[in-house]
């Protein structure tokens, strides 16, 4: 996505004092933003608050727990991929505001809005490696208790931040910035020289590594997950079920829109008005993806009060009850320790 | 280091159509606009148009809308001036410019002097 | 569109004499460029945005003004300075520029 304009205004009404601030957008055929991107301010906004606060908390929670709960593990590094992209926020934020000029330069250009990518499959790597994680405590509860440590944790989190690294390269490598003499403006975005297969080629391994594998791994992963714990429970809680699906599901919702125009502008002529129509909702879908970087503190702490009856425990308090509670691995305990311990469990899907 | 080279001067009738060509080396082709500029002993430096060189959409000065066009050989880093049914007011010194988004032309080709005459 | 209108057209100037070439706009604009042509060759960009001096360009030469008074200053006068300075705007469409002021040496 970010894929340059192809049109250019009429300039008959241009007057345009050459500077670019942020009172004085650089487009005067235009001076008011166009609904889709005053959308997405006030959502680049919310998420960089909660975003930013929400996340330093669960890492300051965490980061105390690391060495000895596997779950803090989880947590802390999802937690840290949603605190990096959300500080490349007040920069997209300016960025819109001007009117889509970026004055930051070509490095800038290359590493912010790669961040969100890197955020997504950071995130959907870590959330199999999650996965994974939940399987083995309920199918293999003895191999877990032999095997299952921090050592291994930080090993399986490593490796899931060097393949999103990997896979955010095409992304960072196709971004440039490239200058407008009329209206003056610089533009950042991705340049595939007009090679359509490539830029396809992009969007296809975007989408099927970054969403609909990992959705169908996690939905198949999370149904035998389920049925199991249901099995071996007398009382078979919705509210599990309830929990599970929105941690599950808001990575997934979030990222529908962007994957969505993403492959759609990749198989559009740039001249159409579905594309031109498309690259208009641009930033609106980026924001939408980058509400995934405030959701999880957000479900960590509706799930804990609904856990724990009202509010009476301190944020920190409560975020440590839901994201360091340790697995017990005996199978037939996995999922029956506690109410609270369910809700660690489930949660670290998200 | 950054160069556009303009191709070499041009003889020409009127009415007849000429193509100048502007070959740039150095830099990201597509991430700087191009412009042309027109020179006459008389009227100076006169601005006729940019062409987004990563779109291809020109854009033509009002003085210059209708016998002007400006083209792109994106794979050739090339841009190009074409005059059609030319006029013996053609006849100048001709330059391509590379635009920058704050006003100015950084770089300019050496210019191609077209004589229009019968 | 915005009339440049440069003073003077053409003038002399000896060796270390400080020199100042004035640009007027009809309108006002927020930058103003400067650049150098000597005969035969294309224009250099010499000052861009106002005051800022171009890649190569000596140090004696400054600029400075704004709204619809420009100016380009050479502190002390040398022989390769002589040429023909145009100023050019971007505020207000179309770009335009100067009329030009050919600088000569005494």
């Known amino acids: 996505m970010d894929s340059f304009n192809y049109t250019t205004p009429d300039y008959g009404h241009y007057d345009d004092k050459d500077t670019l601030d942020l009172n004085t957008p650089v487009d005067k055929t235009s001076n008011t933003l166009r609904v889709p991107d005053i959308l997405a301010l006030v959502i680049f906004a919310v998420v960089f608050l909660v975003g930013v606060l929400g996340n330093a908390l669960v890492v300051w929670v965490t980061a105390f727990e690391a060495k000895r709960t596997i779950n803090a593990i989880w947590f802390l590094n999802l937690a840290v991929a949603d605190f990096l992209s959300c500080l490349a926020l007040p920069i997209l934020f300016t960025s819109i505001v001007q009117h889509h000029h970026w004055p930051f330069g070509g490095a800038a250009c290359s590493i912010l809005p790669s961040l969100i990518l890197l955020n997504m499959y950071a995130s959907i790597l870590l959330l199999a490696t999650i996965s994974a994680d939940r399987f083995l405590l309920v199918f293999k509860p003895i191999w877990c208790q032999n095997f299952r440590g921090a050592g291994l944790a930080w090993i399986a989190c490593a490796v899931a931040w060097g393949l999103a690294l990997l896979l955010t390269i095409p992304s960072f490598l196709y971004r440039v910035v490239r200058e407008e003499y009329f209206p003056p403006k610089v533009l950042c975005g991705v340049d595939y020289s007009h090679d359509k297969r490539r830029e396809r080629a992009v969007a296809i391994v975007r989408l099927v590594l970054g969403f609909l594998w990992p959705l169908l791994t996690l939905t198949i992963c999370y149904t035998f997950i389920l049925l199991r714990t249901w099995s071996r429970r007398a009382t078979r809680s919705t509210k599990t079920l309830k929990v599970v699906v929105a941690v599950v599901a808001s990575f997934f919702i979030f990222w529908l829109p962007y994957q969505v125009t993403g492959i759609m502008m990749s198989f559009l002529e740039p001249s159409s008005p579905t594309f031109l129509l498309l690259k208009k909702l641009d930033s609106l879908c980026v924001s939408f993806a980058y509400i995934n970087c405030c959701i999880n503190p957000i479900i960590y702490v509706v799930a804990g009060q609904g856990f724990q009856g009202r509010l009476r425990k301190s944020l920190p308090s409560l975020l440590r009850n839901v994201l360091t509670e340790e697995s017990v691995v005996r199978e037939s305990k996995s999922f029956t320790r506690s109410t609270v311990d369910t809700m660690a469990q489930k949660t670290q899907a998200v | 280091q950054i160069q556009l080279v303009q191709s070499g001067p041009e003889l020409k009738k009127p009415g007849e159509t000429v193509k100048i060509s502007c070959k740039a080396s150095g830099y990201t082709f597509t991430a700087y606009g191009m412009s042309w500029v027109k020179q006459t002993p008389g009227k100076g430096l006169k601005w006729m148009g940019w062409?987004?060189?990563?779109?291809?959409?020109?854009a033509n000065a009002d003085d210059f809308k209708g016998r002007f066009a400006f083209s792109l050989e994106t794979s050739a880093s090339t841009a190009y001036l074409q005059i059609n049914n030319l006029k013996n007011e053609d006849t100048a010194t001709y330059f391509c410019?590379?635009?920058?988004?704050?006003?100015?032309?950084?770089?300019w080709g050496q210019g191609t002097t077209l004589t229009v005459s019968s | 569109e915005n009339v440049l209108t440069q003073s003077p057209a053409i003038m002399s100037a000896s060796p270390g004499e400080k020199v100042t070439i004035t640009c007027s706009a009809s309108?006002?604009?927020?930058?103003m460029h400067w650049f150098q042509q000597k005969p035969g060759t294309s224009p250099k960009l010499w000052i861009y945005?106002?005051?800022n001096l171009a890649s190569g360009v000596p140090t004696r030469f400054s600029g400075s003004g704004s709204g619809t008074s420009y100016s380009l200053t050479i502190s002390r006068m040398e022989a390769e300075d002589a040429a023909t300075y145009y100023c050019?705007?971007?505020?207000?469409?179309?770009?335009?520029f100067g009329g030009g002021a050919k600088l000569e040496i005494k």
């Open positions: 410019a590379r635009s920058r988004y704050d006003g100015y032309f950084d770089y």
């Open positions: 050019q705007q971007r505020s207000s469409y179309p770009p335009t």
């Open positions: 945005s106002t005051s």
């Open positions: 062409i987004n060189t990563y779109s291809g959409v020109p």
């Open positions: 309108s006002s604009v927020s930058y």
